[in-house]
């Protein structure tokens, strides 16, 4: 059983892993996989994490490329955890409305919109 | 048939009427609604436009809080959409590698990760 | 289990700035299903509420109190901090840090802060 | 602002049923929150949602609201049950949180 890494630490790993694998990768030229067409990734997490799966058996496992699709499967967990977070708490309109207006508030600073 | 409002001018327009009505939203004192726990809110599309739902099943409706609640669903619509193109482009695995390094990037410097 | 802490000087000389910190463990701040709020007790007196600040930095504060009242949050430090301006003698009482769902679920054990020069 | 009223002082001797009230306009149409506090603690949730009770609390709190007034009810009074009881709303006018002035519950022995 692996020591517990904390998520952030993990990420920064797995682009580690991501960037030596690279080559070993790309090496199927035939493979489609697809590929969301904006940036707003947290929309997405279902189909990259699809594509990933789909690389996953397509590559051929052995030393390290295996902990790039293992760390990929536990921030997979992690995101699988937070979206279970969005629906735990009821809470009164008040709270409901101030969370809808950061919501609102980050869309309109920090989110890609194309009109 | 309304004029097209910009996605972003729509979003603006909603977090106005938002804090115009918010006295009227909140006079249901009973009424409890799930709320995420956490400020990854793209994750919690879902759960928020649920919300909503209820929020607008339980407001007396006329006058502009008609056009605030019209607003949240071409909000939802324009999110659909994204959701959408989350899978349309199958593309080769170098690029789906570039997706997946920068969203993987983006999550080790933007997203809110507890450990 | 969500744990408060508050901290700040015991003592503040009338017409000055009380300043208290409340160290929040065991939770996120940014935590979407809580405020976090200051309540106040004075001696041998009931519970009165300061006020309370959401992680995206909207406060609400008892309008009794609202023109000398600062609550801020600072996420990065999983910390929330009470400002009471031009206090006085009336403003010596057990300051309470707590987190407030649907009703106020965690507490702090609560500063004793006296006001006196 | 509402205002909530509650008695200063409330005695019964063990064993008996402690009634503590809670006065505010139309308080039924509010979720009502009960909080015990004893000496030097701070408070501690004994009832929510009018009559709610949270896990750790004996089943002999409970609570009702209507009209003009909410009750917080506790049979079989222990000494234990000493301590000062307030309640809470939230003024939905407002956002606000309203606490009553409490009440202090003795227990006669």
């Known amino acids: 059983i692996p020591t517990e890494i904390p998520t952030s630490a993990l990420v920064k790993e797995t682009l580690a892993l991501l960037s030596t694998h690279r080559t070993l990768l790309i090496a199927n030229e035939t493979l489609r996989i697809p590929v969301p067409v904006h940036k707003n990734h947290q929309l997405c997490t279902e189909e990259i994490f699809q594509g990933i799966g789909t690389l996953e058996s397509q590559t051929v496992q052995g030393g390290t490329v295996e902990r790039l699709f293992k760390n990929l499967s536990l921030i997979k967990k992690y995101i699988d955890g937070q979206k279970k977070k969005c629906g735990e708490e009821r809470r009164r309109v008040n709270q409901f409305l101030d969370y809808l207006q950061e919501f609102l508030g980050v869309m309109n600073t920090e989110w890609i919109i194309e009109s | 048939i309304p004029t097209e409002i910009p996605t972003s001018a729509l979003v603006k327009e909603t977090l106005a009427l938002l804090s115009t009505h918010r006295t009227l939203l909140i006079a249901n004192e009973t009424l409890r609604i799930p709320v995420p726990v956490h400020k990854n809110h793209q994750l919690c599309t879902e759960e928020i436009f649920q919300g909503i739902g209820t929020l607008e099943s339980q407001t007396v409706q006329g006058g502009t809080v008609e056009r605030l609640f019209k607003n949240l669903s071409l909000i939802k619509k324009y999110i659909d959409g994204q959701k959408k193109k989350c899978g349309e482009e199958r593309r080769r695995v170098n690029q789906f590698l570039d997706y997946l390094q920068e969203f993987l990037g983006v999550m080790n410097t933007e997203w809110i990760i507890e450990s | 289990q969500v744990q408060l802490q508050e901290s700040g000087p015991g003592l503040v000389k009338p017409s000055q700035t009380l300043s208290l910190t409340c160290t929040v463990s065991?939770?996120?701040?940014?935590?979407?299903?809580?405020?976090w709020s200051w309540i106040r007790q004075h001696p041998g007196k009931g519970l009165e509420w300061i006020g309370y600040?959401?992680?995206?930095?909207?406060?609400y504060y008892n309008p009794s109190l609202k023109s000398r009242v600062t609550i801020s949050v600072d996420t990065s430090k999983n910390q929330f901090s009470l400002k009471l301006s031009s206090v006085t003698a009336a403003d010596t009482a057990v300051y309470y840090c707590?987190?407030?769902?649907?009703?106020?679920?965690?507490w702090g054990q609560g500063t004793l802060v006296t006001v006196s020069s | 602002s509402y205002v909530l009223t509650q008695p200063p002082s409330v005695s019964v001797a063990p064993g008996q049923t402690a009634r503590i009230t809670c006065g505010g306009n139309?308080?039924?149409?509010?979720?009502v929150y009960w909080y015990q506090q004893k000496p030097g603690q701070a408070p501690v949730l004994v009832v929510h949602?009018?009559?709610d009770r949270p896990s750790g609390i004996p089943e002999r709190f409970s609570g009702s609201n209507s009209g003009n007034t909410a009750t917080l009810t506790i049979s079989r009074v222990e000494v234990g049950d000493e301590a000062d009881y307030s309640c809470?709303?939230?003024?939905?006018?407002?956002?606000?949180?309203?606490f009553g002035g409490g009440t202090k519950l003795t227990v006669l022995g």
């Open positions: 707590a987190s407030l769902g649907n009703w106020f679920d965690y």
């Open positions: 065991g939770d996120s701040i940014s935590n979407g299903g809580y405020y």
């Open positions: 600040i959401y992680y995206s930095g909207s406060t």
């Open positions: 139309n308080i039924g149409s509010k979720n």
């Open positions: 949602d009018d009559s």
């Open positions: 809470q709303v939230w003024d939905s006018s407002s956002d606000h949180v309203v």
